[in-house]
Amino acid sequence: HTAAQDNCTCPTNKMTVCSPDGPGGRCQCRALGSGMAVDCSTLTSKCLLLKARMSAPKNARTLVRPSEHALVDNDGLYDPDCDPEGRFKARQCNQTSVCWCVNSVGVRRTDKGDLSLRCDELVRTHHILIDLRHRPTAGAFNHSDLDAELRRLFRERYRLHPKFVAAVHYEQPTIQIELRQNTSQKAAGDVDIGDAAYYFERDIKGESLFQGRGGLDLRVRGEPLQVERTLIYYLDEIPPKFSMKRLTA
């Protein structure tokens, strides 16, 4: 499947403009903001989604800062530069010529600098830890059932191969989902864990990116799973490079 042929929409990305002007009158969809053609049979890259989101800007938000080499998206929204494949360019700059290096999920991994800043390569985020706290329930969820439901979600909704869901940890009320994906194990056509995590994050916030599909309905053996807090930690294949000043702040 590509875009839905009958009504020419993009099931996996509502932030698109679609028209039947592809080869043979096929439905073709382009991302808002960038105008890049997107594959509606899979998730759209986070870079193109952020760019589309910035075409209708909202207030930026900040997240809690973790320790060690794990990164959290503290910088909020920005209008990113994407490469022709829709991936983040290693170096991002704002309108005031302030530049910084990002990882493959678009999170800053160096101090901010000027236009002379060099970012030699796009460093891959190979391990994502999604930390959730669920609302109080009558009792704890069965760990095995919770594991199955979250794996179902990532497979059915985000099309992520089960081998990339490394583990689901649970200590009521905290749930941790570990996504892992080394460069060597990511085959052509595999959904990127960064894109899956971003779609999940937006779903949890009630800001689904899917076209005309219902919001997230998480149920563990029929019992609703309602998330009240989400934190996402990103670990890169090469540790980030921040000055000691930032690390001790």
Epitope: H1, P11, S41, D147, A148, R151, R152, F154, R155, E156, R157, R159, H161, P162, K163, F164, A166, A167, E178, R180, Q185, R213
Partner: antibody, heavy 118, light 111 residues
């Protein structure tokens, strides 16, 4: 209780197409995908393809040119169609569903025995 | 495609004894600490029945006589002790790579 019930013809002429319907109960097709697996006398079990809850499909590359899987969520039915059958396509065809979502097949239909013969 | 080889096509075991069924993969079926191998039991005229998922996890409702072990390319299904009702063909299946593939099966008989 999760159940998958299959219906379809037993005998197919060579070069003709095969259509099987899998009617499910105890779960919704808007939540779970349905897979198709076949068991041929000389070739053990083979995974053929899947239709996921969102309607997107994945096919075994060996069958992609002649296999189509569709569904009707409102009727809880999944439709399997394979074209250009040959005698070596003879076997039992199953629909199946995952439960743990680690790539296992936890629930199976009863199977449809298909014989390809003139 | 990943090829799963069940080198023993037929196995005869006495009642009350241990049956060991092996499955070898043409490449590793492990990812990030998980082994994506599953075991099924099939009796004539019936669909396969899931026994073990992810190499060593017992499916609900399956007796504890069944256990699974192994990693990377070598996996084992153990039935101990064997009962008369265990006469069947046993298949391994991998889901680490698409397409999912099955072993050729091992037929368990009673001596």
């Amino acid at each position: 209780e999760v159940q998958l019930e299959q219906s379809g013809p037993g005998l197919v002429q060579p070069s003709q197409s095969l259509s099987i319907t899998c009617t499910v109960s105890g779960f919704s097709l808007t939540r779970y995908g349905v897979h198709w697996v076949r068991q041929s006398p000389g070739r053990s079990l083979e995974w053929l393809g899947v239709i996921w809850s969102g309607g997107n499909t994945d096919y075994n590359a060996a069958f992609i040119s002649r296999l189509t899987i569709t569904k009707d969520n409102s009727k809880s039915q999944v439709f399997f169609k394979m074209n250009s059958l040959q005698p070596n396509d003879t076997g039992v065809y199953y629909c199946a569903r995952e439960d743990r979502y680690v790539g296992e097949f936890a629930y199976w239909g009863q199977g449809t025995l298909v014989t390809v013969s003139a | 495609d990943i090829v799963l080889t069940q080198s023993t096509a037929s196995l005869a075991v006495s009642l009350g004894q241990r049956a060991t069924i092996s499955c070898r993969a043409s490449e590793s079926v492990d990812s990030y600490g998980n082994s994506f191998i599953h075991w099924y039991q099939q009796k004539p005229g019936q669909p396969p029945k899931l026994l073990i998922y992810r190499a060593s996890n017992l499916e609900s409702g399956i007796p504890a006589r069944f256990s699974g072990s192994g990693s990377r390319t070598d996996f084992t299904l153990t039935i101990n002790p064997v009962e008369a009702d265990d006469v069947a063909t046993y298949y391994c299946q991998q889901s680490n790579e698409d397409p999912r593939t099955f072993g050729g099966g091992t037929k368990l008989e009673i001596k």
